[in-house]
């Protein structure tokens, strides 16, 4: 039960994360015009990975695509590549994880195969999340560098009468969406990898051995408390005297307020 929950939750978290990565990649607000300590302009500039936009006070917004590939900064190309790789890996991971879900039965698929698929998708989600985080972080670093360079330029070369206002850019909403989405995908991937451990069949064959506990003359046989599924359940089904501790599968879970996000 806990394994299924962990796997299911990992899938959902990754799904939200990948949707966020796609949204961030498509968003136009990767960098937005810095309005702090700037003359108040009636024009607001913002830029994405694919186009730059200008919104006028009139409400008119004009966006122009970057219709060049070679003329773009290498860093921007790298960010694009990282985000696309993240999306592709995430999409493949989602596809694989659907078939790996314990709650979905596809033919006579071995549980070991499901475990392998869960691990594969988990790794894919982890790499996808890392790609997104890396892409967003590279872009953020680029912004910080350019911000301070343009700030320096604002206070130099003003010997003449005419001043040119340098448009400075700061972090846009897409960066925060990307960071959160990348983090969620990463967490989802880790959860899938954890779930994989619970799905993997144990190699140990438990023999019917009599355990003689002091003061008790009871023979314990594995699988005596639950009907064995024949897949890694022996470890869970062993009842031990542990002062009333119960295995995860047996604990009654109650919904908490944090379950509803």
């Amino acid at each position: 039960m806990a394994v299924t929950a962990c796997q299911g939750l990992g899938f959902v978290v990754s799904l939200i994360g990948i949707a966020g990565i796609i949204a961030a990649t498509c968003m136009d607000q990767w960098s937005t015009q810095d309005l702090y300590n700037n003359p108040v302009t009636a024009v607001f500039n913002y830029q994405g990975l694919w186009r730059s936009c200008v919104r006028e006070s009139s409400g008119f917004t004009e966006c122009r695509g970057y219709f060049t590939l070679l003329g773009l900064p290498a860093m921007l190309q790298a960010v694009r590549a990282l985000m696309i790789v993240g999306i592709v890996l995430g999409a493949i991971g989602l596809l694989v994880s659907i078939f790996a879900l314990k709650c979905i039965r596809i033919g006579s698929m071995e549980d070991s195969a499901k475990a392998n698929m869960t691990l594969t998708s988990g790794i894919m989600f982890i790499v996808s999340g890392l790609c997104a985080i890396a892409g967003v972080s590279v872009f953020a670093n680029m912004l910080v560098t350019n911000f301070w360079m343009s700030t320096a330029n604002m206070y130099t070369g003003m010997g003449g009468m005419v001043q040119t206002v340098q448009t400075r850019y700061t972090f846009g909403a897409a960066l925060f969406v990307g960071w959160v989405a990348g983090g969620l995908t990463l967490i989802g991937g880790v959860m899938m990898c954890i779930a994989c451990r619970g799905l993997a069949p144990e190699e140990t064959n438990y023999k019917a051995v009599s355990y003689h506990a002091s003061g008790h003359s009871v023979a314990y046989k594995p699988g005596g408390f639950k009907a064995s599924t024949g897949f890694g359940s022996n470890t869970k089904n062993k009842k031990i005297y542990d002062g009333g501790a119960r295995t995860e599968d047996e604990v009654q879970s109650y919904p908490s307020k944090h379950d509803y996000v």
């Epitope: 015009q33 003359p39 108040v40 302009t41 009636a42 024009v43 500039n45 913002y46 830029q47 730059s52 936009c53 200008v54 006028e56 006070s57 009139s58 409400g59 008119f60 004009e62 122009r64 005419v162 001043q163 040119t164 206002v165 340098q166 448009t167």
Partner: antibody, heavy 118, light 113 residues
């Protein structure tokens, strides 16, 4: 077609209040901001500020902060300019104008002459 | 505030002549985001409200005759009327449409001989 029709001329005494209206037609009122421009007799144009007719937020030029207030009534498709505590230097023609491409003042009202005389 | 300086203040020309008027701003009106200059030209005929002629420094508004041409970039702008007509008698204003507060030039009064 887009039209801005302003209220008629006003004759006021110093210290009084005047409220000029600007009724819009031919477009979605909340889609375009409304600007106000002052033109003293025989003088040039002076931008007073504008009101975002969607949010109701106003931006005023420094010379028009305090006694001047912009407002709008979406249901009536009308923008208003109110001048409190009128002074002699407020005697002018006041124009309303909508923002267009390039933040230009694309469509203008016919103007409202405010005369301040004791 | 941005200062808009127009020259000359008065222009007297004969019909059919080419006329050029200048407008200078104290700061660049070029927006790097779209490479457009936020400079607007208006024509105000006697007893009428101003009429939009040109926005983005060089884009003619719909219905404006093609004898009106706007040019320039950054801080220096020009309005050219290739063949002045009798109905062009008016005051022409340039306006900063980039920085708040929007500011107008003092105007160039065009008179026909």
């Amino acid at each position: 077609q887009i039209q801005l029709v302003q209220s008629g001329p006003e004759l006021k005494k110093p210290g009084e209040t005047v409220k000029i209206s600007c009724k819009a037609s031919g477009y979605t009122f909340t889609n375009y901001g409304m600007n106000w421009v002052k033109q003293a007799p025989g003088k040039g144009l002076k931008w007073m500020g504008w009101i975002n007719t969607y949010t109701g937020e106003s931006t005023y030029a420094d010379d028009f902060k305090g006694r001047f207030a912009f407002s709008s009534e979406t249901s009536a498709r009308t923008a208003y300019l109110q001048i409190n505590n009128l002074k002699n230097e407020d005697m002018a023609t006041y124009f309303c104008a909508t923002l267009g491409y390039g933040n230009s003042l694309a469509y203008w009202g016919q103007g409202t002459l405010v005369t301040v005389s004791s | 505030d941005i200062v808009m300086t127009q020259s000359p203040s008065f222009l007297t020309v004969t019909a059919g002549e080419k006329v050029t008027m200048s407008c200078k701003s104290s700061q660049s009106l070029l927006n790097s985001g779209n490479q457009k200059n936020y400079l607007t030209w208006y024509q105000q005929k006697p007893g009428q409200p101003p009429k939009l002629l040109i926005y983005w420094a060089s884009t003619r508004d719909s219905g404006v005759p093609d004898r009106f041409t706007g040019s320039g970039s950054g801080t220096d702008f020009t309005l050219t009327i290739t063949s002045v007509q009798a109905e062009d008698l008016a005051v022409f204003y340039c306006q900063n449409a980039y920085f708040y507060p929007f500011t107008f030039g003092s105007g160039t009064k065009l008179e026909i001989k």
